[in-house]
């Protein structure tokens, strides 16, 4: 007899996980030399080891920590991307300015880009038909609590100048609820962290105003002086220059603002 | 246990190629790169490339490229060097070894010699 | 391509004593850097990865350390089976590149 399953409001553990998953750190170690020590095999065992037997909706950073430690990976001081809503262009920049690193060109964000996955209370099985939505059903789910849980390592270990890209169409430039404000900003390191710059992505070709006067960006700033990080703001009224500057910063045309 | 067994010695001919064998075993052979070293007497370790099992990519070291050709046998859980156009200076052990914990076979003994 | 220099090519110790063992790499390579032992007859064997983290079932004696471009294999208490060769090797780009190595003997 078929066993009743549980029915959430989210969808359900990606098809092919633990093939995704491994394959991904596979290819990770092929891509980024500096991290063959890390034992593809033991990776796994502990993402799995985070979510596998254990009610859903009951999920803490704590069982993700075995996970991290395997993942454990630093960033050059000035180096950190972080980003909100607009995680295409971060992604397209850093593809370009190797240099710099968003959560997802690490280890574990990238092990973890896009997918969902959830198991079952008592059982060793993964749910494919459906996982807990962070509104609908509950906020401690295992795809939350992992994002939470590595923003918060992503943010901790970022020092010099830390750099973010927000998107300039949303209602809310700033948003107190996303990771970005709600793990990122509170996790930096005044210690460690000099300043944060924030870079207002522009949507319309036509929109030259200043989004660094907008009030959600003025609280952003309120919040990170409080910290004792000096902010900075920048709009980027062109993105799509913006990508093309960093690929040819010797183009006459860059010479100009974007 | 990990084991990567690799195959015997050869003698060959100046000019002509051979195909090196490590058979991987006690673990999931497309879960770890595999890479390939070589050691010459007095000359200490050379690394020639790397292969991924799974998608069969490769990363060569560019003072091999043409010399080594990597590949896998997913079924038989085995990867292979082809080293083509021979010459003495090809004359080494050859070593593969496995990324993460550093397993490394037991090595292949290659004499070019006419 | 990374050049990793072993200056030392021997080096010679007592039974009980002391030894450091040191490569310099031509440029930043972070803490990318592995060691290996290579017992006379046999394959390199890894004992330290990432600069300073030592592989399950190497002795304690065994204790890497350095980033960026000097590192440092210190073998403490030497042992008569510690005689090898030591290699460094540098993965933080590719082509990996080693050091020509330092033979150690036990006098």
């Known amino acids: 007899l078929p066993r009743w399953r549980q029915q959430w409001s989210g969808s359900g553990t990606t098809s092919r996980f633990p093939e995704t998953v491994l394959a991904r750190c596979v290819k990770y170690t092929e891509v980024h030399p500096e991290m063959r020590h890390v034992d593809c095999q033991s990776v796994w065992d502990a993402f799995k080891g985070a979510f596998i037997s254990k009610y859903p909706c009951n999920i803490t950073e704590e069982d993700y920590q075995p996970l991290v430690k395997l993942g454990t990976q630093t960033v050059p001081c000035n180096k950190t991307l972080l980003w909100s809503r607009i995680k295409d262009l971060a992604h397209q920049f850093t593809q370009v300015q190797r240099d710099m690193f968003t959560l997802e060109d690490m280890l574990l964000g990238y092990l973890a880009d896009d997918l969902t996955w959830c198991g079952e209370f008592n059982t060793f099985e993964i749910n494919y038909q459906s996982c807990p939505d962070w509104r609908k059903d509950c906020s401690n789910n295992p795809v939350s609590v992992f994002w939470k849980t590595v923003s918060r390592r992503f943010a901790e270990t970022a020092c010099g100048v830390v750099h973010v890209m927000l998107n300039g169409s949303r209602s809310k430039i700033f948003d107190k609820n996303s990771t970005f404000g709600s793990v990122e900003v509170h996790n930096l390191q005044p210690e460690k962290v000099q300043a944060l710059e924030a870079w207002v992505i522009h949507g319309g070709r036509e929109d030259s105003r200043d989004l660094c006067q907008d009030p959600t960006i003025k609280e952003l700033e309120s919040i990170i002086s409080k910290r004792n990080i000096r902010f900075f703001c920048k709009n980027i009224y062109r993105p799509d220059k913006f990508l093309q500057c960093v690929k040819n910063p010797e183009d006459s045309s860059c010479l100009s603002g974007i | 246990q990990v084991q990567l067994q690799q195959s015997g010695p050869e003698l060959v001919r100046p000019g002509t190629s051979v195909k090196v064998s490590c058979k991987a075993s006690?673990?999931?052979?497309?879960?770890?790169?595999v890479e390939w070293i070589k050691q010459r007497p007095g000359q200490g370790l050379e690394w020639i490339g790397v292969?991924?099992?799974?998608?069969?990519?490769?990363n060569y070291n560019e003072k091999f490229k043409g010399k080594a050709t990597l590949t896998v046998d997913r079924s038989s859980t085995t990867a292979y060097m082809h080293l083509s156009g021979l010459t003495s200076d090809d004359s080494a052990v050859y070593f593969c070894a496995r990324y993460a914990y550093g397993y490394w076979g037991q090595g292949t003994t290659l004499t070019v010699s006419s | 391509d990374i050049v990793m220099t072993q200056s030392q090519k021997f080096m010679s110790a007592s039974v009980g004593d002391r030894v450091s063992i040191t490569c310099k790499a031509s440029q930043n390579v972070g803490t990318a850097v592995a060691w290996y032992q290579q017992q006379p007859g046999h394959s390199p064997k890894q004992l330290i990865y990432s600069a300073s983290n030592r592989y399950t079932g190497v002795p304690d004696r065994f204790t890497g350390s350095g980033a960026g471009t000097d590192f440092t294999l210190t073998i403490s208490n030497i042992q008569s089976e510690d005689l090898a060769d030591y290699f460094c090797?540098?993965?933080?780009?590719?082509?990996?590149?080693f050091g020509s190595g330092t033979k150690l003997e036990i006098k």
């Open positions: 292969i991924n099992p799974g998608s069969g990519s490769t």
């Open positions: 090797q540098q993965y933080s780009t590719y082509p990996f590149t």
């Open positions: 006690g673990y999931a052979f497309t879960t770890y790169l």
